[in-house]
Interface confidence: low
């Protein structure tokens, strides 16, 4: 079962999920120009065992000129709203990041891919927040939303965030740790579609950051 | 498959310059960021540069403003870093690496960036020796 809505919105924030439980499913689409091939897949799915998880099917595309050239992209179901996306990356060579059991990492790149990637979630899926550049993170709990199944229906839990006012320059946007959720783990496996935009954040999917000053300038 | 090659390292004398290439295959940068990272023996990999594909907005690390600089060409599929000024301890391995960035659906989103984090990249290059020594 789908979640009925997108998670919260905080004003001045963004969210993204950092990884991604099992049965989460990622469409297939292409950008502009091209289409998907005609034999492929409508969707990538997150499967696995206890040990591993990966991502199921391919996404594939070909110039919408040519009917053989083959290219890589992501899927779409018709009848689907028009949500928010998730941005995430996928290991080449990690540095240091342990994988959660049970959730699969952002699937690879692909060549002309669209520039959105539309995610089904499941029930248990957790989403980070942070915020945007220019504003503060002040915390009364923890920056996440959950998609948890109560009473039949699914929800996304509130996140305890507020951004507000202007940053030293010198700061990046949302440097605060999110805090761990009590409540941020599945119950049951239901999906949830969403997606969220790119952001940084902390988490126990990610190494500990070290504050550190960096100049941000236009080129 | 997906790549991220550096060229461009060598040897140097201190004050002299260099310019690293960071090419990528399997995948386009467009709606990619770019970090540089560089390692020096006996120490952590740290952040040296960074730039954004959708506005071409810049991080620095303070310890390297005003020598280096960051450039990116699209139809090429790569990214330059250009060393000036170059010291004894800017001797180390340079990494280049990318992150995906989303399409920013906020109207509060645009300019929300990414700093030299080793654990905000994914993918990553080989790395090119660089050794500035007289």
């Known amino acids: 079962e789908l979640c009925d809505d997108d998670p919260p919105e905080i004003p001045h924030a963004t969210f993204k999920a950092m990884a991604y439980k099992e049965g989460t499913m990622l469409n297939c689409e292409c950008k502009r120009g091209f289409r998907r091939i005609k034999s492929g897949s409508l969707y990538m799915l997150c499967t696995g065992n206890s040990s591993h998880s990966s991502w199921d099917n391919q996404c594939q595309c070909t110039s919408s000129a040519t009917r053989n050239t083959t290219k890589q992209v992501t899927p779409q179901p018709e009848e689907q709203k028009e949500r928010k996306t998730t941005e995430m990356q996928s290991p080449m060579q990690p540095v240091d990041q342990a994988s959660l059991p049970g959730h699969c990492r952002e699937p690879p790149p692909w060549e002309n891919e669209a520039t959105e990637r539309i995610y089904h979630f499941v029930v248990g899926q957790m989403v980070y927040y942070q915020c945007v550049q220019g504003y503060r993170a002040l915390h009364r709990g923890p920056a996440e939303s959950v998609c948890k199944m109560t009473h039949g229906k699914t929800r996304w839990t509130q996140p305890q965030l507020i951004c507000t006012g202007e940053m030293e320059t010198s700061q990046f946007p949302g440097e605060e740790k999110p805090q761990a959720s009590p409540e941020g783990r599945p119950e049951s496996e239901t999906s949830c579609l969403v997606t969220t935009t790119d952001f940084q954040i902390q988490t126990e999917m990610a190494a500990t950051m070290e504050t550190s000053i960096f100049t941000t300038e236009y080129q | 498959e997906v790549q991220l090659l550096e060229s461009g390292g060598g040897l140097v004398q201190p004050g002299g310059s260099l310019r690293l290439s960071c090419a990528a295959s399997g995948f386009t940068l467009d709606y990619y960021a770019i970090g540089w990272f560089r390692q020096a023996p006996g120490k952590e990999r740290e952040g040296v540069l960074s730039i954004s594909s959708t506005d071409g907005r810049t991080y620095y690390a303070d310890s390297v403003k005003g020598r280096f600089t960051i450039s990116r060409d699209n139809p090429k599929n790569t990214v330059y870093l250009q060393l000036n000024s170059l010291r004894p301890e800017d001797t180390a391995v340079y990494y280049c690496?990318?992150?995906?960035?989303?399409?920013?659906?906020?109207?509060?989103?645009?300019?929300?960036?990414?700093?030299?984090?080793?654990?905000?990249?994914?993918?990553w290059g080989q790395g090119t020796q660089v050794t500035v020594s007289s």
């Open positions: 690496a990318a992150k995906r960035l989303g399409p920013m659906v906020h109207q509060y989103s645009l300019e929300v960036l990414t700093p030299l984090f080793l654990d905000e990249y994914d993918y």
